[in-house]
């Protein structure tokens, strides 16, 4: 059974969040996909979306967000560069499938951005200058404004009992901590 989970990324200002959302490629390869932020008690807000129909391996840049949809692999890559403290929050990928409600993808991302000197990014960070090598492109279609009320969510439980840390032998990098939290709807 698929579990809706949350993965926590702790990064410093100026660093890059680099994540992927997977989807059933047979069903959703060319569907328009979006990156949303979920604020407690509010409707998810769409920050960026792919073109409609979504183009294969074609980066779309909206401000500091870059989306890249690998159709033939069923993967949407999301990068948020030059992170700011205000970017902290809960994020999700969704697939637009009008007239049906948006289809939410696993997993949700809990991003925590803290102040801290990032200076010259370390070897395990992707510097914004490298990320911006992608030629900026804009979406041809605006992201749909409609988001189903059904995707309004409660914040997951804050109890540390529900937080499981990665296996102790995992050494991701010294800048990224990922914590998996079950989400109870």
């Amino acid at each position: 059974a698929t579990k809706l989970t949350e993965e926590k990324y702790e990064l410093k200002e100026g660093q890059t969040l680099d994540v992927k959302c997977d989807y059933t490629l047979e069903k959703f390869a060319s569907s328009q996909k979006a990156w949303q932020i979920i604020r407690d008690g509010e409707m998810p807000k769409t920050l960026a979306c792919t073109e409609r129909p979504s183009k294969n391996s074609h980066p779309v840049q909206v401000g500091r967000i870059i989306l890249e949809d690998y159709h033939d692999h069923g993967l949407l890559r999301v990068r948020m560069v030059n992170l700011q403290v205000e970017d902290s929050g809960l994020y999700q990928c969704v697939i637009y499938q009008p007239p049906k409600e948006p289809h939410m993808l696993f997993d949700r991302i809990r991003l925590v951005v803290t102040k801290g000197f990032s200076g010259t990014p370390g070897s395990n960070e992707n510097s914004t200058q490298n990320v911006y090598k992608i030629p900026p492109t804009t979406t041809k279609a605006l992201c749909p404004l409609y988001t189903s009320p059904r995707t309004v969510t409660q914040a997951p439980p804050k109890s540390t009992a529900d937080v499981s840390t990665p296996d102790s032998e995992i050494n991701l990098t010294n800048v990224t901590d990922i914590i998996r939290v079950p989400v109870f709807n």
């Epitope: 994540v19 992927k20 997993d107 510097s127 990320v131 050494n171 991701l172």
Partner: antibody
Framework: QVQLVQSGAEVKKPGASVKVSCKAS????????INWVRQATGQGLEWMGW????????GSVKKFRDRVTMTRDTSISTAYMELSSLRSEDTAVYYC????????????????WGQGTLVTVSS | DIQMTQSPSSLSASVGDRVTITCQAS??????LNWYQQKPGKAPKLQIY???NLETGVPSRFSGSGSGTDFTFTISSLQPEDIATYYC?????????FGQGTRLEIK
């Protein structure tokens, strides 16, 4: 500790299919993608594709797309890779591999490898 | 697809030597590069990830550097147990590809 234990060697005839299993232990199976990498005798490494054991979604490189199926059984923490329409050039050692980071991270660093399964295709 | 070209394809060195292997990507891959060691009859082992980060348990004589298109893997003082084939691998985009490998032998 993390362990990936693969099924034993197989000998198959051209045109047949092979299903390789990969049993995971020492970590939460559904939290990390499983990838498959193959290596023909005396040759280099070739990435075949990935599977997210939580969602069950998978993807494979073009050359295998019509012939490979990646599945899992979460109840026994086991991933499977089935390759059909076998030909002699599919003779190789097939590895299942777990990535370094959780399934949402764009971090394709192959940290934990199974011991490999030799598949020989011969008439 | 991004092509990864390793050089040399084979290399013979003496114990205690400094050994350098290079990997060139066909386009800018930032620091999305890993290095693996494979001993005969064994599965590969991750040595360096993200171009320069040493994997846990890997001796400090191994190091990696570079970004963009040119990367280097160095063994500061070759030991007999380092005899293996070394591979680079990028993950800047899909599909992921490996270099063709560098076979390292003891003189």
């Amino acid at each position: 500790q993390v362990q990936l234990v693969q099924s034993g060697a197989e000998v198959k005839k051209p045109g047949a299919s092979v299903k390789v299993s990969c049993k995971a232990s020492g970590y939460t199976f559904t939290s990390y993608d499983i990838n498959w990498v193959r290596q023909a005798t005396g040759q280099g490494l070739e990435w075949m594709g990935w599977m997210n054991p939580n969602s069950g979604n998978s993807g494979s490189v073009k050359k295998f797309r019509d012939r490979v199926t990646m599945t899992r059984d979460t109840s026994i923490s086991t991933a499977y890779m089935e390759l059909s329409s076998l030909r002699s050039e599919d003779t190789a050692v097939y590895y299942c591999v777990r990535l370094i980071g959780y399934s949402s991270a764009w971090k394709w660093s192959f940290q934990h490898w199974g011991q490999g399964t030799l598949v020989t295709v011969s008439s | 697809d991004i092509q990864m070209t390793q050089s040399p394809s084979s290399l013979s060195a003496s114990v205690g030597d400094r050994v350098t292997i290079t990997c060139q990507a066909s386009r800018d891959i930032s620091k999305y590069l890993n290095w693996y060691q494979q001993k005969p009859g064994k599965a590969p082992k991750l040595q360096i990830y993200d171009a320069s980060n040493l994997e846990t348990g890997v001796p400090s004589r191994f190091s990696g550097s570079g970004s963009g298109t040119d990367f280097t893997f160095t063994i500061s003082s070759l030991q007999p147990e380092d005899i293996a084939t070394y591979y680079c691998q990028h993950y800047d985009n899909i599909p992921i590809t490996f270099g063709q490998g560098t076979r390292l032998e003891i003189k």
